[in-house]
């Protein structure tokens, strides 16, 4: 025996891929709108066309959908140093990035700031600067890494983390001071 589908089961059954349930009649599956368009009117009945309209300037949809409105195009954040890599089209949002010799630092999932890649002065490049990561520097002897810059051990204070790295230097300075000259 084939079990009878009640209203709830019918309501819960999903439409095939590329279609969605008509909001007023869950026995009708309407075809979704293509990317670059949005839903203006649901299909009137089974096998009938959904009324989709193209997104207006300044808006987009990047995938097939049944959205009542297109999404607003993102704006690149000048105050964060961002530049436009590619402009918004009806089917693709604006792509923002950084200038050459800069990297992105993400303060949160959807917010990044552009910073200049470190040049590793008084050190060597351990890992080159990448799109989302600053250069990794290794400092020469007599220098320590502070805020990704190689700083002279003469700027190392006892309270700072640099004391271990600069210990031989500090001892040498002390030794020179302590040794009396005749």
């Amino acid at each position: 025996l084939v079990p009878h589908l009640g209203d709830r089961e019918k309501r819960d059954s999903v439409c095939p891929q590329g279609k969605y349930i008509h909001p007023q009649n869950n026995s009708i599956c309407c075809t979704k709108c293509h990317k670059g368009t949005y839903l203006y009117n649901d299909c009137p009945g089974p096998g009938q066309d959904t009324d989709c309209r193209e997104c207006e300037s300044g808006s987009f949809t990047a995938s097939e959908n049944h959205l009542r409105h297109c999404l607003s195009c993102s704006k690149c954040r000048k105050e964060m140093g961002q530049v436009e890599i590619s402009s918004c089209t009806v089917d693709r949002d604006t792509v923002c990035g950084c200038r050459k010799n800069q990297y992105r630092h993400y303060w949160s999932e959807n917010l990044f700031q552009c910073f200049n890649c470190s040049l590793c002065l008084n050190g060597t490049v351990h890992l080159s600067c990448q799109e989302k990561q600053n250069t990794v520097c290794t400092c020469h002897a007599g220098f320590f890494l502070r805020e990704n810059e190689c700083v002279s051990c003469s700027n190392c204070k006892k309270s700072l983390e640099c004391t271990k790295l600069c210990l031989p230097q500090i001892e040498n300075v002390k030794g020179t001071e302590d040794s009396g000259t005749t």
């Epitope: 954040r77 000048k78 105050e79 964060m80 630092h105 303060w107 700031q113 910073f115 600053n134 805020e147 990704n148």
Partner: nanobody
Framework: EVQLLESGGGLIQPGGSLRLSCAAS????????MVWVREAPGKGLEWVSH????????YYADSVKGRFTISRDNSKNTLYLQMNSLRAEDTAVYYC????????????RGQGTLVTVSS
């Protein structure tokens, strides 16, 4: 010397409102993008909101969007954060800061003001 002094924090019931202020001195306030960040107990620093130099472009974290409003008065060298419909998860120390320029760390930020949302 750069100084940022936050005020306006306190104990507030869920659903309530608070207005934080940040008095700035020692630099040209109108030339800087300003930021509000917060640090909840046992959590890292979270970017809450920022406002550009002229107050035209603003940003809000998803967690505060529609509830918080950032503003500034360049004639008074003051940054504000209007916080409405407060929730327990908004409990944190709130700091104002100058947008970093050299790298992803805050060279200049205030001492913070504690906001506690509890019934």
């Amino acid at each position: 010397e750069v100084q940022l002094l936050e005020s306006g924090g306190g104990l507030i019931q869920p659903g309530g409102s608070l207005r934080l202020s940040c008095a700035a001195s020692g630099f040209t306030f109108a030339h800087e993008t300003m930021v509000w960040v917060r640090e909840a107990p046992g959590k890292g620093l979270e970017w809450v909101s920022h406002i550009d130099r002229v107050g035209q472009d603003t940003y809000y974290a998803d967690s505060v969007k529609g509830r918080f409003t950032i503003s500034r008065d360049n004639s008074k060298n003051t940054l504000y954060l209007q916080m409405n419909s407060l929730r327990a998860e908004d409990t944190a120390v709130y700091y104002c800061a100058i947008l970093p320029k050299r790298g992803p760390w805050f060279d200049y930020r205030g001492q913070g003001t504690l906001v506690t949302v509890s019934s």
